[in-house]
């Protein structure tokens, strides 16, 4: 008996061939001997089976001695043994229909779980193997689960169902809803405008939800909500914003926030959360702001940074085109009685400059000029 595997919702062609290469009488029946379809001369005739409106054949192939049964929009319950009667012979074909579906939605939040469920006909014992877009293989029986979805899990999952040494392939498109970056850091000189961007790692037709940026300033004892906003069909509207600082927000995606001035009291870290409509859980992106200030008070030239810096970052003070006068893994450095000239305050990581502030030191009788 020939075995054919089909996919739920798909179309399948069951073949039946006669030795004579001409149109002769044929009938297709199911295992209960109920007629599905056949011919009467050149006419296609249909029986009282439940397949009636989904069964078809190809007249053009009859003249070649081929009498296919085509079943459209396959259902699991179409799994059966189909019998083709032609030239006093019977050809049997066993059709097994499988379905593979994602547990809920195919749009899942980062960190959530994906469960794939296999629908199979009674009496079958299929095995399933799925390959994620990043090449990870998972195997299982009726259900397959992947916990803690990551951004790289977005894309087409290819699942192969094996039964009777035959296989059928399913492709399921999964979208992991997340920000492109889990965390970002912005380095700014005091007084500069700060731009925060929160690009999403996915695109959908309509995007609706609400969000909020909570900020924990380094100098503050508790965090504070800086802004709340709504997202409707990719249009952003601000609901509430603090007076200090007065953030501005772009009206279109990607989510974009502007802080008019980088000030030491704003240095710290924030957490932007985005709750999407009809989704449980939220998307998160951490953002950090490091602010630098270089000052000269009397005979003391000081450089300071505020905000979340790693212990391996180096803060230096140097006269332009000269060796660093002072260089420390600290958040403040200073030089007493600095020489006149253009001084540079540098925040660097393994030799790479992250932030730079210049201050002009004038001869001792005049006051300093800060560019």
């Amino acid at each position: 008996k020939k075995v054919v595997l089909g996919k739920k919702g798909d179309t399948v062609e069951l073949t039946c061939t006669a030795s004579q290469k001409k149109s002769i009488q044929f009938h297709w029946k199911n295992s209960n001997q109920i007629k599905i379809l056949g011919n009467q001369g050149s006419f296609l005739t249909k029986g009282p089976s439940k397949l009636n409106d989904r069964a078809d054949s190809r007249r053009s192939l009859w003249d070649q001695g081929n009498f296919p049964l085509i079943i459209k929009n396959l259902k699991i319950e179409d799994s059966d043994t189909y019998i083709c009667e032609v030239e006093d012979q019977k050809e049997e074909v066993q059709l097994l229909v499988f379905g593979l579906t994602a547990n809920s939605d195919t749009h899942l939040l980062q960190g959530q779980s994906l469960t794939l469920t296999l629908e199979s006909p009674p009496g079958s014992s299929p095995s399933v193997q799925c390959r994620s877009p990043r090449g990870k293989n998972i195997q299982g029986g009726k259900t397959l689960s992947v916990s803690q979805l990551e951004l790289q899990d977005s894309g087409t999952w290819t699942c192969t169902v094996l039964q009777n040494q035959k296989k059928v392939e399913f492709k399921i498109d999964i979208v992991v809803l997340a920000f492109q970056k889990a965390s970002s850091i912005v380095y700014k000189k005091e007084g500069e405008q700060v731009e925060f961007s929160f690009p999403l790692a996915f695109t959908v037709e309509k995007l609706t939800g609400s969000g909020e940026l909570w900020w924990q300033a380094e100098r503050a004892s508790s965090s504070k909500s800086w802004i709340t906003f709504d997202l409707k069909n990719k249009e952003v509207s601000v609901k509430r914003v603090t007076q200090d600082p007065k953030l501005q927000m772009g009206k279109k995606l990607p989510l974009h926030l502007t802080l008019p001035q980088a000030l030491p009291q704003y240095a710290g870290s924030g957490n932007l959360t985005l709750a999407l409509e009809a989704k449980t859980g939220k998307l998160h992106q951490e953002v950090n702001l490091v602010v630098m200030r270089a000052t000269q008070l009397q005979k003391n030239l000081t450089c300071e940074v505020w905000g979340p810096t790693s212990p391996k970052l180096m803060l230096s003070l140097k006269l332009e085109n000269k060796e660093a006068k002072v260089s420390k893994r600290e958040k403040a450095v200073w030089v007493l009685n600095p020489e006149a000239g253009m001084w540079q305050c540098l925040l660097s990581d393994s030799g790479q400059v992250l932030l730079e502030s210049n201050i002009k030191v004038l001869p001792t009788w005049s006051t300093p000029v800060q560019p």
Epitope: G6, T11, V12, E13, L44, R59, S60, D63, I70, I71
Partner: antibody, heavy 112, light 107 residues
Framework: QVQLQQWGAGLLKPSETLSLTCAVY????????WSWIRQPPGKGLEWIGE???????NYNPSLKSRVTISVDTSKNQFSLKLSSVTAADTAVYYC?????????WGQGTLVT | DIQMTQSPSSVSASVGDRVTITCRAS??????LAWYQHKPGKAPKLLIY???SLQSGVPSRFSGSGSGTDFTLTISSLQPEDFATYYC?????????FGQGTKLEIK
């Protein structure tokens, strides 16, 4: 909703080989036959040939010696090659899904 | 090959008119016939299959009849969007063949 999207070179010189591809989106690829049909300027429709997912083909005898239709099931695509073209092969070429009737059709590609 | 002959090759009519197009097969094709509507720059659209079955989404003003060698497409009340070229096609045997087309124009 099944959609067919086709592409290929639109301008050829005599004796060259015409090459077109049609991608099937959003529906079953197996169980159907996939056809190529053409319409020369100001003329009627002419069936070129067809293929199914397992590579079984049927061709119009008038073009059979020059036509090759192939299938790539991994991409849900099928292709047409027509060799030794002449000015008489200038037409809009369509791909279409078929059991007995052609539905749906691709958007058409003018090949000159 | 089975030859399909349509008549008339063109017809002028007005909105609201009833229009009939005929198609004749050179041999018996029982009910293995379809009708298509084709507008310039667009893909042909299946209207009627198996001689008289209305394709899903096609307005009920379109109807088909006939069996054997003679077939008819009828548009009961012409609408402005119906002005196009109409083709019949036989699916009885290879090669599939089409009629030469009937152009329906505004009077």
């Amino acid at each position: 909703q099944v959609q067919l999207q086709q592409w290929g070179a639109g301008l050829l010189k005599p004796s060259e080989t015409l090459s077109l591809t049609c991608a099937v989106y959003g529906g079953s690829f197996s169980g159907y036959y996939w056809s190529w049909i053409r319409q020369p300027p100001g003329k009627g429709l002419e069936w070129i040939g067809e293929i199914n997912h397992s590579g079984s083909t049927n061709y119009n005898p008038s073009l059979k010696s020059r036509v090759t239709i192939s299938v790539d099931t991994s991409k849900n695509q099928f292709s047409l090659k027509l060799s030794s073209v002449t000015a008489a092969d200038t037409a809009v070429y369509y791909c279409a899904r078929v059991i007995n009737w052609f539905d749906p059709w691709g958007q058409g590609t003018l090949v000159t | 090959d089975i030859q399909m002959t349509q008549s008339p090759s063109s017809v002028s009519a007005s909105v609201g008119d009833r229009v009939t197009i005929t198609c004749r097969a050179s041999q018996d094709i029982s009910s293995w016939l379809a009708w298509y509507q084709h507008k310039p720059g667009k893909a042909p659209k299946l209207l009627i299959y198996a001689a008289s079955s209305l394709q899903s989404g096609v307005p009920s003003r379109f109807s088909g009849s006939g069996s054997g060698t003679d077939f008819t497409l009828t548009i009961s009340s012409l609408q402005p969007e119906d002005f196009a070229t109409y083709y019949c096609q036989q699916a009885n045997s290879f090669p599939y063949t089409f009629g030469q087309g009937t152009k329906l124009e505004i009077k």
